[in-house]
């Protein structure tokens, strides 16, 4: 169905944008509070959205040092913004078998961001591999 695939595309383009925000934050990793955060890795199939929400819930914080505080806080806020809802996301919400956020290994900000980026890339890969050839236009 064309409109639902366009909605999915728009949703994945948002994921694509999140990767750039993660990359931006990686530049300021020394200005983040060096706290250990749950960082899902090797996420099992159908638990991607659950893992995604774990990354969004994590308390990534600026160390409030230097003049990078504003860009860091804006970037973190954008990472936490709720993405548009999709059927895939709704379906996965009903899976009770996905690990809880606390069960994931905790990592410092650098590895946390790297793992977040890997998950986003995996989700985009799954989306692009499952759709027919054609444009990402909306």
């Amino acid at each position: 169905h064309k409109s639902s695939s366009q909605g999915q595309d728009r949703h994945m383009i948002r994921m694509r944008q999140l990767i750039d925000i993660v990359d931006q934050l990686k530049n300021y990793v020394n200005d983040l509070v060096p706290e250990f955060l749950p960082a899902p890795e090797d996420v099992e199939t159908n638990c991607e959205w659950s893992a995604f929400s774990c990354f969004q819930k994590a308390q990534l914080k600026s160390a409030n040092t230097g003049n990078n505080e504003r860009i860091i806080n804006v970037s973190i806020k954008k990472l936490k913004r709720k993405p548009p809802s999709t059927n895939a996301g709704r379906r996965q919400k009903h899976r009770l078998t996905c690990p809880s956020c606390d069960s994931y290994e905790k990592k410092p900000p650098k590895e946390f961001l790297e793992r977040f980026k890997s998950l986003l890339q995996k989700m985009i890969h799954q989306h692009l591999s499952s759709r027919t050839h054609g444009s990402e236009d909306s």
Epitope: D23, I124, E136
Partner: antibody, heavy 116, light 107 residues
Framework: QVQLVQSGAEVKKPGASVKVSCKAS????????MHWVRQAPGQGLEWMGT????????IYSQNFKGRVTMTRDTSTSTVYMELSSLRSEDTAVYYC?????????WGQGTLVTVSS | DIQLTQSPSSLSASVGDRVTITCRAS??????LNWYQQKPGKAVKLLIY???RLHSGVPSRFSGSGSGTDYTLTISSLQPEDFATYYC?????????FGGGTKVEIK
């Protein structure tokens, strides 16, 4: 259909600033980030940075940080790229490009010539 | 920054020829590789995104393949309108970077 229409050619003196505009149409302006890329005469393409038109969030290339400012006007679906402290090496064609999964639509380019 | 090395930098070919352009990244870019076409005085056009996905309106004679660090753009049967410069670009990591370009000229 998606269209990106850029402002006309500019001639500037070294040390001056230039502001290039890029008017978008044919899609929801705030759904897609806009990137800026430049091309010096006879050279390849160089990425300058990107702006999220929904909230004016920007990411700039280290090569231009401190000299480039990207802004937007949602009422006219236009993004702007301002480059300051111009030098002769900034002579180039400047492109805006919409970013979906890639830079899927590009403006026609704006030639900026820096000459004393 | 991720470096992209395109080869060849230029090539001469005839209409109907099969043309292959390669792009090598300095690190694994996980298929986040796009191809563009540029003609003098014209807007740049996206041909292929995410290694092998054909952008809308792009003829099927264009195809892309690759993984890891090595990627290829193939034009199965070169047409007169295909004489242009082609660029690869990685979308894996900021900053966005482009290959040096490959100019396809008429033999």
């Amino acid at each position: 259909q998606v269209q990106l229409v850029q402002s006309g050619a500019e001639v500037k003196k070294p040390g001056a600033s230039v502001k290039v505009s890029c008017k978008a149409s044919g899609y929801t302006f705030t759904d897609y980030w806009m990137h800026w890329v430049r091309q010096a005469p006879g050279q390849g393409l160089e990425w300058m940075g990107t702006i999220d038109p929904s909230d004016q969030y920007t990411i700039y290339s280290q090569n231009f940080k401190g000299r480039v400012t990207m802004t937007r006007d949602t009422s006219t679906s236009t993004v702007y790229m301002e480059l300051s402290s111009l030098r002769s090496e900034d002579t180039a064609v400047y492109y805006c490009a919409r970013y979906g999964f890639a830079m899927d639509y590009w403006g026609q380019g704006t030639l900026v010539t820096v000459s004393s | 920054d991720i470096q992209l090395t395109q080869s060849p930098s230029s090539l001469s070919a005839s209409v109907g020829d099969r043309v292959t352009i390669t792009c090598r990244a300095s690190q694994d870019i996980s298929n986040f590789l796009n191809w563009y076409q540029q003609k003098p005085g014209k807007a740049v056009k996206l041909l292929i995104y995410y290694t092998s996905r054909l952008h809308s309106g792009v003829p099927s004679r264009f195809s892309g393949s690759g993984s890891g660090t090595d990627y290829t753009l193939t034009i199965s049967s070169l047409q007169p309108e295909d004489f242009a410069t082609y660029y690869c670009q990685q979308g894996h990591t900021l900053p966005r970077t482009f290959g040096g370009g490959t100019k396809v000229e008429i033999k």
